[in-house]
């Protein structure tokens, strides 16, 4: 069918929860492109009605919930003017029972996410959740071992459970908590997170290193299209969010309206002693407005930068 | 403890109606995929239909489908099975399982009800 | 639909013995199998799901192995209570199907 295969991701989820995967490949999705969702090789795509179950929402696939039955590979189809791309989702559904006392105490959250924290030190477990605007997220509660997380060391700041000198009674089975509504609909978001302790800070420390970029300027014509990658050395066993922002805000957040500059999927090499991490920022077309903004990179408590410069004029052009 | 009890068994004309409940109690029933399964007199076990955690996916044996409907109200902890046509072959004991799939792929009912039995006869 | 063939269909054996039940699946379902014990009169029972795992309270003499399409139900020492009719079920794809069954009856 002429499409270009890029990748296939595999995805391993609780049942009886929202779901929700986006689909985007930037730069390939940052141009004037129709994503459609299809499920199992089917010719028919995924519906686009809200009240459905499962549906597509704008680049989204959205389940609602999750359940028995929805396991399979999913293939989102980007098209351009000249272009075709597809994306591979393999979906497992695993039937998860927090805390329900027929089963028997705690599942194994072995496929669940896994997270560190350094003992002695402050440090944050992350909820990550990742949804389309349509779906509004109430505030995030915490729990370990079944009980709502309660206690001075231990505050809750957006989807990060701050958690103040950490002590080893500290490593657990925890979960995060969410309710989400969706076209007047409640549905709660329940992750389980395996958390265990360590003392070493790991290659070179436990502050993430930005290789690049080096808080330096960078000389583009107006109107081209720029890519710039943030390229980060971590700990293998780190919880640092990485990402760009600009004026303090999220540049996906910030250029929400239009799109023009976006933050693109992060991937990473995994070595020996660390991982090094890619995360890029695509300028669709640079404008007048973006020279001498400081495009931030942040990664944990660092953070690196680069400026916008108009080239110098060519005098030998004249 | 995990009960599963079925009703709305008994004896139905040949092209009759007739619809089986099941009340669950003991569990998150809300959290778990269910199933029928039924078994003629001195035969073996038949599975019949199975349904997702809010029903949004339903499945049949090919001798009924089209003819049965599997549904579930939530919030009554209720399964049901609509069964329209009805055949002699149909007449059978009706068991109500809870299906469990913890590994992803491949499942199990690990819970069963006593069953209800439905005769179709003239 | 996959088929699901069990051998033999009834079988006697005596307190003690080692008993081997059989299940063949007419294409290979990977480990996605269960058996299940019924007694006359009475709702069947998960004794074993995903070929080998045994569900919780059942007597460590009943296990299972076998992978594809070829499938085994041992008990290695048969007890008065293990006389029944056992049950392997696929449930790798839908309509999930039973085999016919195995009547273990005393010699």
């Known amino acids: 069918d002429g499409c270009k295969d890029i990748f296939m991701k595999n995805e391993i989820l609780s049942a009886s929860q929202p779901f929700a995967f986006n689909c985007t490949f930037p730069p390939i999705t940052s141009g004037e492109v129709s994503v459609t969702w299809y499920k199992n090789s089917s010719k028919i795509p995924v519906s686009k009605i809200i009240q459905s179950r499962i549906h597509q929402d704008e680049t989204w696939i959205l389940f609602l919930p999750m359940e028995w039955g929805d396991s399979g590979v999913y293939q989102c189809v980007i098209k351009g003017r000249d272009s075709c791309h597809r994306i591979h989702v393999n979906l497992t559904v695993f039937e998860k029972h927090w805390c329900d006392t027929s089963i028997g105490g705690l599942p194994n959250l072995s496929d669940e996410y896994k997270q560190i924290l350094h003992l002695g030190k402050d440090d944050s477990l992350t909820c990550h959740l990742h949804f389309p605007k349509s779906c509004v997220l109430g505030p995030i509660k915490w729990y370990k071992d079944c009980n709502e997380i309660k206690g001075e060391r231990f505050t809750v700041l957006e989807t990060r459970l701050l958690v103040s000198n950490v002590s080893a009674e500290d490593r657990g089975n925890y979960a995060c908590q969410a309710i989400l509504t969706h076209s007047g609909k409640q549905y709660e978001v329940l992750n389980g997170i395996t958390v265990s302790i360590t003392e070493r800070a790991g290659y070179g420390g436990s502050v993430p290193k930005i290789i690049y970029p080096k808080n330096h300027s960078i000389e583009v014509q107006l109107g081209t299209t720029l890519i710039v990658d943030c390229n980060v050395t971590d700990t293998k066993d780190n919880t640092n969010l990485r990402c760009w922002r600009v004026n303090n805000t999220l540049v996906d957040d910030y250029y929400d309206e239009s799109k023009r500059i976006r933050e693109g999927v992060e991937t990473h090499v995994s070595f020996r002693e660390h991982n090094l991490y890619t995360v890029n920022i695509t300028f669709l077309e640079v404008k007048m407005e973006d020279y001498g903004l400081p495009f931030m990179c942040h990664a944990g408590v660092s953070t690196a930068y680069i400026i916008l410069q108009l080239p110098a004029p060519d005098f030998r052009a004249y | 403890e995990v009960q599963l009890l079925e009703s709305g068994g008994g004896l139905v004309q040949p092209g009759g109606s007739l619809r089986l409940s099941c009340a669950a109690s003991g569990f998150i029933f809300s959290r778990y995929a269910m199933s029928w399964v039924r078994q003629a007199p001195g035969k073996g076990l038949e599975w019949v239909s199975a349904?997702?955690?809010?029903?949004?996916?339903?499945y049949y044996a090919d001798s009924v489908k089209g003819r049965f409907t599997i549904s579930r109200d939530n919030s009554k902890n209720t399964l049901y099975l609509q069964m329209n046509s009805l055949r002699a072959e149909d007449t059978a004991v009706y068991y109500c399982a809870r299906q469990r799939y913890p590994g992803g792929s491949g499942s199990y009912a690990d819970y069963w009800g006593q069953g209800t039995l439905v005769t179709v006869s003239s | 639909d996959i088929q699901m063939t069990q051998s033999p269909s009834s079988l006697s054996a005596s307190v003690g013995d080692r008993v081997t039940i059989t299940c063949r699946a007419s294409q290979s379902i990977s480990t996605d199998l269960n058996w299940y014990q019924q007694k006359p009169g009475k709702a069947p029972k998960l004794l074993i799901y995903?070929?080998?795992s045994l569900q919780s309270g059942v007597p460590s003499r009943f296990s299972g192995s076998g992978s594809g399409t070829d499938f085994t139900l041992t008990i290695s020492s048969l007890q008065p209570e293990d006389f029944a009719t056992y049950y392997c079920?696929?449930?790798?794809?839908?309509?999930?199907?039973f085999g016919g069954g195995t009547k273990v009856e005393i010699k």
């Open positions: 995903g070929v080998s």
């Open positions: 079920q696929q449930s790798h794809s839908t309509p999930f199907t």
């Open positions: 349904i997702s955690e809010s029903g949004g996916n339903t």
